[in-house]
């Protein structure tokens, strides 16, 4: 299985109906704290301000922000740990007409109020400590 | 310039007058905080204790620490930061009879008290969110 | 040159609390690196490193000790002090106080020692 | 629980040399350092960092260690080295664990 290169950067344009869905493996096992982080920025820049950002700290803790011209803003944060040592986990992020939905190798794990309307979303960025081997957004038909 | 494969991990020995040598760039602005993280291992597992464990929150910080029969012991913190946004850095961890001495571009950043002998290392890993270009240890002459 | 003083009570009940203060002079507690420790000595036998407390407030406890052990700190008097609790005629020792640069070197400065008996 | 083994007593010639070890399985990962104690006194360090000399100490005092021993050497002892000599080392980098100490006697 061919691997996508990290950090990973695409084109994206959401709103309520659209799923990311992200598949990979953590790149250190639990006890050295990998982190996987996943960006939904308003620009193509990564420097942009990022209307969800998703941060896992593998066996330790997840944690939820926005970053609003150039500030983050209050930190989320949950121990919830759905994710397993070595393992391949596949993560959804739908969006929802009040919140993005996080699960978790099918099972819901997470949940994010929208601070920022997902459609100034332009940008996805995946990375840290993970090889990917699957990006995808799907969009509502409309 | 080829890149090495991040994580990198390689067998090593050390002693005084060992240098270890690291050439990287850091893979996002600091603004997203990308970091560096080198450990020098007591074996070649991942999961084995750390002697010393050096890591990088470029534009914010640096921790320095062991991990001793599984666990963190006290943490030293530097805000010195002369890492670069966006520049490629030279790193080299010299082996003095008492310390790590840490230099970044050819000045003497951090300094780290031996807390366990620097012959019990095994193993160095660099990792996170950097690309790699040069790794070197260099070894006294007796 | 950095002088260690011990002082406290040289008799002490059973099951009560044993307390001690080391006063520092000569040099700062909140130095960066320094530790400050307590080790005892029963008569006639060898050294037992109980505690310490570190530069940043820190403490770190003996494993066979720690349930009864607390040190803390004054640094407006740069004073440091252990507190032993439900002492027994066991805890008869010579207490000393010592400064550790860091890990590589060794407790270079010592208090000249205090001698508390346990007794009723 | 770590811990350090030293004979309980030494005895040497004057102006010979006599060794010292302690035995303990985490001295291949931390430092081994040596105390002297005489009667009535604290103790004062004369090695630490395996084998480190402080200022003052003399220089037939030395100390070398070698996989889970540590040895402290005293090349020529002197009647005033007659004392109680305890080596220090680690059962982590912050619990300090001392051996049961050694007597030397000097004849």
């Known amino acids: 299985m061919s691997l996508l290169p990290v950090p990973y950067t695409e084109a994206a344009s959401l709103s309520t109906g659209s799923t990311v869905t992200i598949k990979g493996r953590p790149l250190a096992c639990f006890l050295n704290e990998p982190y996987l982080q996943v960006d939904f920025h308003t620009e193509m820049k990564e420097e942009s301000d990022i209307v969800f950002h998703f941060q896992v700290c593998f066996g330790r803790r997840v944690v939820m922000n926005s970053r609003e011209y150039g500030a983050w803003k209050q930190q989320v944060e949950s121990k919830n740990m759905p994710f397993q040592d070595g393992q391949e986990f596949e993560l959804s992020i739908s969006v929802l007409p009040d919140k993005y939905q996080v699960m978790v190798n099918g099972q819901s794990s997470y949940t994010f109020d929208h601070r920022i309307k997902p459609e100034a979303v332009k940008m996805v960025q995946v990375w840290r400590d993970i090889s990917l081997t699957k990006f995808n957004v799907s969009y509502l038909k409309r | 310039m080829s890149l090495l494969p991040v994580p990198y991990t390689e067998a090593a020995s050390l002693s005084t007058g060992s240098t270890v040598t690291i050439k990287g760039r850091p893979l996002a602005c600091f603004l997203n905080e990308p970091y560096l993280q080198v450990d020098f291992h007591t074996e070649m597992k991942e999961e084995s204790d750390i002697v010393f464990h050096f890591q990088v929150c470029f534009g914010r910080r640096v921790v320095m620490n062991s991990r001793e029969y599984g666990a963190w012991k006290q943490q030293v913190e530097s805000k010195n930061m002369p890492f670069q946004d966006g520049q490629e850095f030279e790193l080299s961890i010299s082996v003095l009879p008492d310390k790590y001495q840490v230099m970044v571009n050819g000045q003497s950043s951090y300094t780290f008290d031996h807390r366990i002998k620097p012959e019990a290392v095994k193993m160095v890993q660099v990792w996170r969110d950097i690309s790699l270009t040069k790794f070197n240890v260099s070894y006294l002459k007796r | 040159q950095v002088q260690l003083v011990e002082s406290g009570p040289g008799l002490v009940k059973p099951s009560q609390t044993l307390s001690l203060t080391c006063t520092v002079s000569?040099?700062?507690?909140?130095?960066?690196?320094?530790?400050w420790s307590w080790i005892r000595q029963p008569p006639g036998k060898g050294l037992e490193w109980m505690g310490a407390?570190?530069?940043?407030?820190?403490?770190y406890y003996s494993p066979s000790l720690k349930s009864r052990t607390s040190i803390s700190r004054d640094t407006s008097k740069n004073q440091f002090t252990l507190h032993l609790s439900s002492v027994t005629p066991e805890d008869t020792a010579v207490y000393y106080c010592?400064?550790?640069?860091?890990?590589?070197?060794?407790?270079?400065?010592w208090g000249q020692g205090t001698l508390v008996t346990v007794s009723s | 629980n770590f811990m350090l083994t030293q004979p309980s007593a030494v005895s040497v010639s004057l102006g010979q040399t006599a060794r010292i070890t302690c035995q303990g399985a985490?001295?291949?990962?931390?430092?081994g350092i040596w105390y002297q104690q005489k009667p009535g006194q604290a103790p004062v360090q004369v090695i630490y960092?395996?084998?480190n000399r402080p200022s003052g100490i003399p220089e037939r005092f030395s100390g070398s260690s070698s996989g889970g021993t540590a040895t402290l050497t005293i090349s020529g002892a002197q009647a005033e080295d007659e004392a109680d000599y305890y080596c220090?080392?680690?059962?982590?980098?912050?619990?300090?664990?001392f051996g049961g100490g050694t007597h030397l006697t000097v004849l």
């Open positions: 407390i570190a530069y940043s407030g820190s403490t």
């Open positions: 985490n001295l291949g990962r931390y430092y």
């Open positions: 960092g395996d084998s």
């Open positions: 220090q080392s680690y059962e982590s980098s912050t619990s300090p664990v």
């Open positions: 010592a400064r550790r640069p860091n890990w590589y070197r060794a407790l270079d400065a």
């Open positions: 000569g040099g700062s507690i909140t130095t960066n690196s320094y530790y």
